[in-house]
């Protein structure tokens, strides 16, 4: 005949409070015959977690019919886990004896512990905006796990970056524990649309991570480039000129017209476009009256992105006749 | 819902014999073990013995050996408690319980000449 | 045979006050296999305290139950009037099993 085993599958087993947990025993043997009991911890002061036939186990019931012929699966479920429920369940066959059953034989026992799920990561990025080819900090933060142990990972767009530094605290015992990451990301000039994302990795979560995500378009800041042109063509006694404001991020953005250092207060006709990457366009025209009396006119575009300091770009209209010369200089 | 139900109230001479019945529903007595009880008037409780209905084997308390004989009958979800040469200390009141949990409603034996 | 002895036999208190009821084990007894009943009189005994401190489904709160080895106790920590009755502690630890003499809990 085959000896019989108690097998225990699981070593450990996490748990949830409030949770079932399910803890699993099989034979592999029909004899001798006598019950399959149930215990925490070993010795003379083991508690008895499930007797079938006698007891009050509220909490308790069998995954398979015990009482089927041919039974061999003594596997149990608990309801509504709690921290005292920690320890380590042994299944223990017995042999029917008397005037005492005795023990025969005990699996190899399963521990549980418990498991608590981490928090959502929690995503923060810079207080201010960078600009590109900077490196900005973004810190990544969840509570509450155990056990200890937790993987943590960074990705900008999918590419996984490995310039970073976390911490779980405490470093000691506790009932649960908090990770803090540190990512360094150097900016790029098209990463309004980028994305860095936390991902949190944790045995309670059963191979289904955590995420947690900020945007680049929140952290970057990409300046403008100026250019002002004139038309070649002139209506009358007007020439219009036209300042591009182009690549610039956020929308945020004050433009002025100078006539020869006067601002001019006049309306003038803009558009704003957004461009694949994310970042504006700003164009505005500005319609300038001339007479061949009228001594040269420089007209400066200047531009305030973000509260940043400005910038403009300078046209002189060297106006003839024929309106053939033109030329321009940038001053920051 | 778990039930059950004992058999009426006896009265019996001393020598005499007398089986008093447990049935049950709500449950397979199979499962269980099936105890039975002793209350004599005004007094305590006393344990007098069980079954393992599975496979009819028993227990029994030292006091009682030998006078008392439990049985079950799976077929019908019924236990029995058996006790013979009966005299005047064992008026009691008899209760069948499931595995300590669940008691049924105890049954009067009164034992006169 | 493990012996329980209970006290006091009697108990006499009011409503309101804590009860105390001891229940003391010849030899040990394992926790898991402690139990206490209650009965009334006319009825059988209801399962109310099991594995020596969990109380069985629609018990109050103000029961509790707590010791180990040869020493248990079951606490009630204000006496409502529905709560006079027999207590009786329990031991499955070992053949036979034994009931102590039971603790009556009286109205003063």
């Known amino acids: 005949e085959e000896e019989l085993q108690m097998i225990q599958p699981e070593k450990l087993l996490l748990v949830t409070v409030g949770k079932t947990a399910t803890l699993h025993c099989t034979v592999t043997s029909l004899l001798p015959v006598g019950p399959v009991l149930w215990f925490r911890g070993v010795g003379p002061g083991r508690e008895l977690i499930y007797n079938q036939k006698e007891g009050h186990f509220p909490r308790v019931t069998t995954v398979s019919d015990l009482t089927k012929r041919n039974n061999m699966d003594f596997s149990i479920r608990i309801s509504s886990i709690t921290p005292a429920d920690v320890g380590t369940y042994y299944c223990v066959k017995f042999r029917k004896g008397s005037p005492e059953n005795v023990e025969f034989k005990s699996g190899p026992g399963t521990e549980m512990a418990l498991g608590a799920k981490p928090s959502a990561p929690v995503v923060l990025g810079p207080a201010a905006r960078t600009t590109p080819e900077h490196t900005v900090s973004f810190t990544c933060e969840s509570h509450g796990f155990s056990p200890r142990d937790i993987t943590l990972k960074w990705f900008k767009n999918g590419n996984e970056l490995s310039d970073f530094q976390t911490n779980v605290d405490p470093t000691g015992q506790s009932v649960a524990y908090s990770i803090r990451s540190t990512a360094r990301v150097v900016l790029d000039p098209w990463d309004v649309r980028s994305q860095v994302i936390c991902e949190v990795a944790h045995v309670t979560l059963q191979g289904d991570p955590l995420r947690g995500t900020a945007n680049l378009s929140e952290a970057i800041r990409v300046p403008p480039t100026l250019e002002v042109t004139q038309q070649p063509m002139r209506v009358g006694n007007q020439v219009n000129v036209t300042c591009q404001v182009r690549k610039f991020y956020p929308q945020s953005l004050q433009l002025t017209w100078s006539e020869n250092g006067n601002v001019c207060q006049r309306e003038t006709a803009s558009t704003l476009t957004e461009n694949k990457d994310g970042t504006y366009n700003w164009t505005s025209w500005f319609l300038v009256n001339i007479s061949d009396q009228r001594d040269d006119v420089v007209l400066t575009c200047q531009v305030k992105h973000d509260g940043q300091l400005a910038v403009s770009k300078r046209l002189a209209l060297e106006v003839t006749v024929h309106q053939k010369d033109q030329s321009s200089d940038a001053t920051p | 819902e778990v039930q059950l139900v004992q058999s009426g109230a006896e009265v019996k001479k001393p020598g005499a014999t007398v089986k008093i019945s447990c049935k049950v529903s709500?449950?397979?007595?199979?499962?269980?073990?099936m105890h039975w009880v002793q209350q004599a008037p005004g007094k305590g409780l006393e344990w007098i013995g069980r079954?393992?209905?599975?496979?009819?084997?028993?227990k029994y308390a030292p006091k009682f050996q030998g006078r008392v004989t439990i049985t079950a009958d799976t077929s019908t979800n019924t236990a029995y408690m058996e006790l013979s040469s009966l005299r005047s200390e064992d008026t009691a009141v008899y209760y069948c319980?499931?595995?300590?949990?669940?008691w049924g409603q105890g049954t009067l034996v009164t034992v006169s000449s | 045979e493990i012996v329980l002895t209970q006290s006091p036999a009697t108990l006499s208190l009011s409503p309101g006050e804590r009860a105390t009821l001891s229940c003391s084990a010849s030899?040990?007894?394992?926790?898991?296999?402690l139990y206490w009943y209650q009965q009334k009189p006319g009825q059988a005994p209801k399962l109310w305290i099991y594995?020596?401190?969990n109380l069985a489904s629609g018990i109050p709160a103000r029961f509790s139950g707590s010791g180990s080895g040869t020493d248990y106790t079951l606490t009630i920590s204000s006496l409502e009037p529905e709560d006079f009755a027999v207590y009786y502690c329990?031991?499955?630890?070992?053949?036979?099993?034994?009931f102590g003499q039971g603790t009556k809990l009286e109205i003063k």
């Open positions: 030899s040990s007894v394992s926790s898991s296999y």
């Open positions: 594995s020596t401190s």
């Open positions: 329990h031991q499955w630890s070992s053949y036979p099993y034994t």
């Open positions: 709500g449950f397979n007595i199979k499962d269980y073990y």
């Open positions: 079954i393992d209905p599975e496979d009819a084997e028993t």
């Open positions: 319980d499931r595995g300590l949990a669940y």
